[in-house]
Every structure is written in structure tokens, then in C-alpha cells.
Interface confidence: medium
Amino acid sequence: HNTTVFQGVAGQSLQVSCPYDSMKHWGRRKAWCRQLGEKGPCQRVVSTHNLWLLSFLRRWNGSTAITDDTLGGTLTITLRNLQPHDAGLYQCQSLHGSEADTLRKVLVEVLADPLDHRDAGDLWFPGESESFEDAHVEHSISRSLLEGEIPFPPTS
């Protein structure tokens, strides 16, 4: 799998989309997991509703939400109030039994918060950044990881 990069702004919301073949993955629940190390396990963050027919319902774990359009074949993950520690490698998964197929490998990059540079004369409400429903705070800049690019930031 190629890795797709999604960039989001710190303090705002990031939407990650994972397209898949809706027929091939019919009846399967989906999950979002975080890769622990380059060869480590993928730790489950959140999964879709236990009843596959209700996969369209948004489920939350902390600040991460998941929803699945099973007909259209798009899994959507929302990372609310994105923070620097959210940066890293993730996977969208399709579950069957105890197995999991990787739908997409995702590298989340967190950009600096431009709000930090707003001056006092601006009218800014904290809740505007927290509200993932507001279209103007949704950012999803994605690109494919180039061959040879390292999906993990160097450890300090």
C-alpha cells in the first residue's frame, strides 16, 4: 500500500477519507488504528458501529470519530482539535473475524496553528476551532507519500 498524507492545522479538525470497494467489503466493519513503530502493531483507535447496518452513525473515541458510507464505499475519520502528538502513521482497516485488511495507510501531519498569529483586534471564539461541524475548520490536504519518503518523523 502507498501511504497517503493528510495535513491538518493544530487546534482544528482534520478529515481523513479512505475509499474502498463497497462490494468486496460488504458486511464488514471498519476501524482506524495507529501504527506503533515501523514494524509494530496497529493499535485500534476507533471502529464503526457493532451493527454493520448502522455503520453510518458517527462513533467517537476521545477526539476521534469514524463513520462509514457503506454504499458509496468511503470510510471517514475526523480528528477533532488536532494536536502535534496526533502526527504519525495510521491505517484504515476492514475487519473480518479476527483479521484486518488494510484499506489505506495514512500519514497525518500537523501544521502550526495560524490562529497563534492573530491579533487582538480579530473576533475569534475558541469554540469555532473546537466545532468540527463548521466547514471552515475542516482541513484535509492529502497527497501520496513519494517513494523513499520516511513515514515516521525522526526521533529526537
Partner: antibody
Framework: EVQLLESGGGLVQPGGSLRLSCAAS????????MTWVRQAPGKGLEWVSA????????YYADSVKGRFTISRDNSKNTLYLQMNSLRAEDTAVYYC???????????????WGQGTLVTVSS | DIVMTQSPDSLAVSLGERATINCKSS????????????LAWYQQKPGQPPKLLIY???TRESGVPDRFSGSGSGTDFTLTISSLQAEDVAVYYC?????????FGGGTKVEIK
Amino acid sequence: EVQLLESGGGLVQPGGSLRLSCAASGFTFSTHAMTWVRQAPGKGLEWVSAISANAGKTYYADSVKGRFTISRDNSKNTLYLQMNSLRAEDTAVYYCASLRGGYEVGPTFDSWGQGTLVTVSS
Amino acid sequence: DIVMTQSPDSLAVSLGERATINCKSSQSVLYSSNNKNYLAWYQQKPGQPPKLLIYWASTRESGVPDRFSGSGSGTDFTLTISSLQAEDVAVYYCQQHYIWPITFGGGTKVEIK
């Protein structure tokens, strides 16, 4: 010393219009967001409208949306509130206030004028 | 809209005694990016405009006496006057400055017993 002086209040009939002004001095008006807050006689505070320093952003309470317009003239250090289609329930003392804003603080009203009374009655 | 509910509506306290005012918001006003609560308190004396006392739930505005203190987080907040003075007779309002529309509590009238 920060001074905010409201004017333009008075008695107006329902359906009528008024334009309130707020003359600011003692601070750099052009770098401060501003707001209008009202208080009906014997009642609590109700936020009405706010405008960013460069007038690029405006907000209105649902109760006045479509009837009131906030504006400012930074060259005259003056804030305005154009009030149209006035109703009896708009009767109140109208205060103008400077907003301490920006990323960290969020809008708090740090300096207030003395207010101007608007009475809507036939 | 965030609804701010204050209690009690009025409060009579002896001079030098503690006065406590509560404010509850219908949703959290805690901004998780900086862990600050966007809740302010104002004092309005008879015939005067309101005056900012506290913002971020617990940060006193400069010049405000230290007998005024704010506490709380999320949805439940308290303004405390540790030792009531005659000049503290006023109506006190909480206000959320977390998201528009800005909303105020209904006010609490503090009197001397």
C-alpha cells in the same frame, strides 16, 4: 483613560429606525474589536452585536439579525449600530464596549460606555 | 446557543462574610487546546455599566481586589467574594466567551444582610 460615549438613543415608534453612535478615545480604536450589549429596564445583559477591528467579521444575536447592522469608522474612532424595524422588546439601555480578543483571551468586554436609552413605544 | 444559568437570583450576606455565586453552562466552555475555560464574571453596580472582574474562569482583571475569586471548569463555575464589603453590593453576571452568540447568565443580586 479609555472613554466610550454612546449617543443617538431616544423615543421611537414601533417599526421605526434609530442609529446609535459610540465615540471612542483613550485607546487605539482601530486595533480593537467592538460590541454592543443591551439591558432592558430591570433586566439582565443581552449581547447584541460585535465587529472585528478591521470590520471583516460581524456577529449578531438572533433577536436582531436582519434588523440591526453594526459598522465602524476607524478614521473617526466611532462605532455605529443601525437599528431598523424596531420593536417594543428592543427597549433597553444600549452599551458599547471594547472587546479584548485574539487567540488567547477570546472576547471579553473590558471597557464599557455609560449607555444610551432606546425606548420603542407608540 | 450556550445557556448560562446563575444561582441564586439574589443573596443577602453580612459584611465580612463570604458570598458565593454559581453559574452553570449548558455545554462545556473548556478549550482543550490551552486548557482554559472561557468564562467571565462582571459586576454591575446600580446606575453603572458592568465591569469585568474575572476572565478564563479564574484570572482576575487588573485592579480587581483579591477578595474576588473565580473557580470551576467545564460547565460549573463559582464566583466567591471572600469577605463582603459595602462597595460589593451589585448584580453579578457570568458570561461565556467560548463561542458566539456570547451569552450571559441572568444575574445574581448581592445585598448586605
